[in-house]
């Protein structure tokens, strides 16, 4: 399999609303027309697929309607946003990039972004 370098930040802290964003950048060895991006979550040595999208260069990423991910692309960068995160979702989120067309097929896997999610403290009851 032809390997490709993928870079992503080491650590990201989710917002109080459970939203985390990070950039996934890949070093395309040729001109890519169609790219597939997959976000994987690794926790306790188990890897699960969080979301995936295939996009044509210059077009928007289209995740499934019920996906917790959204994203935009610009050149060889993909800006990924994961929503609805809770403390239990803390883990290593790995960006996997595949150059689907034109051939040859290339695969690149990042080292992962550790996303920390802290559940907000419930608001104390007010006297007002």
């Amino acid at each position: 399999c032809k390997a490709m370098h993928v870079a992503q930040p080491a650590v990201v802290l989710a917002s109080s609303r459970g939203i985390a964003s990070f950039v996934c950048e890949y070093a395309s060895p040729g001109k890519a027309t169609e790219v597939r991006v997959t976000v994987l979550r690794q926790a306790d040595s188990q890897v699960t697929e969080v979301c995936a999208a295939t996009y044509m260069m210059g077009n928007e990423l289209t995740f499934l309607d019920d996906s917790i991910c959204t994203g935009t692309s610009s050149g060889n960068q993909v800006n990924l946003t994961i929503q609805g995160l809770r403390a239990m979702d803390t883990g290593l989120y790995i960006c996997k990039v595949e150059l689907m067309y034109p051939p040859p097929y290339y695969l690149g896997i990042g080292n992962g972004t550790q996303i920390y999610v802290i559940d907000p403290e419930p608001c104390p009851d007010s006297d007002f």
């Epitope: 032809k2 027309t33 044509m56 067309y101 034109p102 051939p103």
Partner: antibody, heavy 116, light 110 residues
């Protein structure tokens, strides 16, 4: 440049299945898609589906989705196309072709005749 | 995934030029840089003559040229010769690892 050699002609009964092979040699197999294209006598070319061997996940034309299975064996550099529930109108030449941004290499074709 | 539209046949005298059109949609021809053309003689496998809209593989005569405007691709054969008599097919990448071929055009050299 890769060469593609297909299995020989087949005669099949309606309702049965046929499996055609396509062996690659002399080039890169794993990372270049292999497509299957058929041509009924006196008719045009029809894309059936394809596979990137290293991925192993095929894509099919809607028309053939329910009846075709495309696989690839990296260890032998061979792609396969199986068509089930054969009908007389499946009588055709079946070609494999390697995709390098275009189908630049074709197999010699396999004639499949469906007749009772 | 309906076939791209090509004229059923075109003809010309030796030395003349003929043009074959290939009409699709914005989802295939109009939106793809990967439009190719194939020549097929009776009983033979197709042969690539144009790729990526207008590029010629090595060994293919420069009498063959390709172009695209909107949802229509075109193949031009100039200086028509007897050996150009064959069927010609366009093909476009249609996204998500799928392709669509044209209906085919028979070229006759008068």
């Amino acid at each position: 440049q890769v060469q593609l050699v297909q299995s020989g002609a087949e005669v099949k009964k309606p309702g049965s299945s046929v499996k055609v092979s396509c062996k690659a040699s002399g080039g890169t197999f794993s990372t270049y898609p292999i497509s299957w294209v058929r041509q009924a006598p006196g008719q045009g070319l029809e894309w059936m589906g394809g596979i990137i061997p290293i991925l192993g996940t095929p894509k099919y034309a809607q028309k053939f989705q329910d009846r075709v299975t495309i696989t690839a064996d990296e260890s032998t550099s061979t792609a396969y196309m199986e068509l089930s529930s054969l009908r007389s109108d499946d009588t055709a030449a079946y070609y494999c072709a390697q995709d390098n941004g275009a189908f630049d290499t074709w197999g010699q074709g396999t004639m499949v005749t469906v007749s009772s | 995934q309906s076939a791209l539209t090509q004229p059923r046949s075109v003809s010309g005298s030796p030395g003349q030029s003929v043009t074959i059109s290939c009409t699709g949609t914005s989802s295939d021809v109009g939106g793809s840089d990967y439009v190719s053309w194939y020549q097929q003689h009776p009983g033979k496998a197709p042969k690539l003559i144009i790729y990526e809209v207008s590029k010629r593989p090595s060994g293919v005569s420069d009498r063959f040229s390709g172009s695209k405007s909107g949802n229509t691709a075109s193949l031009r054969i100039s200086g028509l010769q007897a050996q150009d008599e064959a069927d010609y097919y366009c093909c476009s990448y249609a996204g998500s690892s799928t392709f669509v071929f044209g209906s085919g055009t028979e070229v006759t050299v008068l």
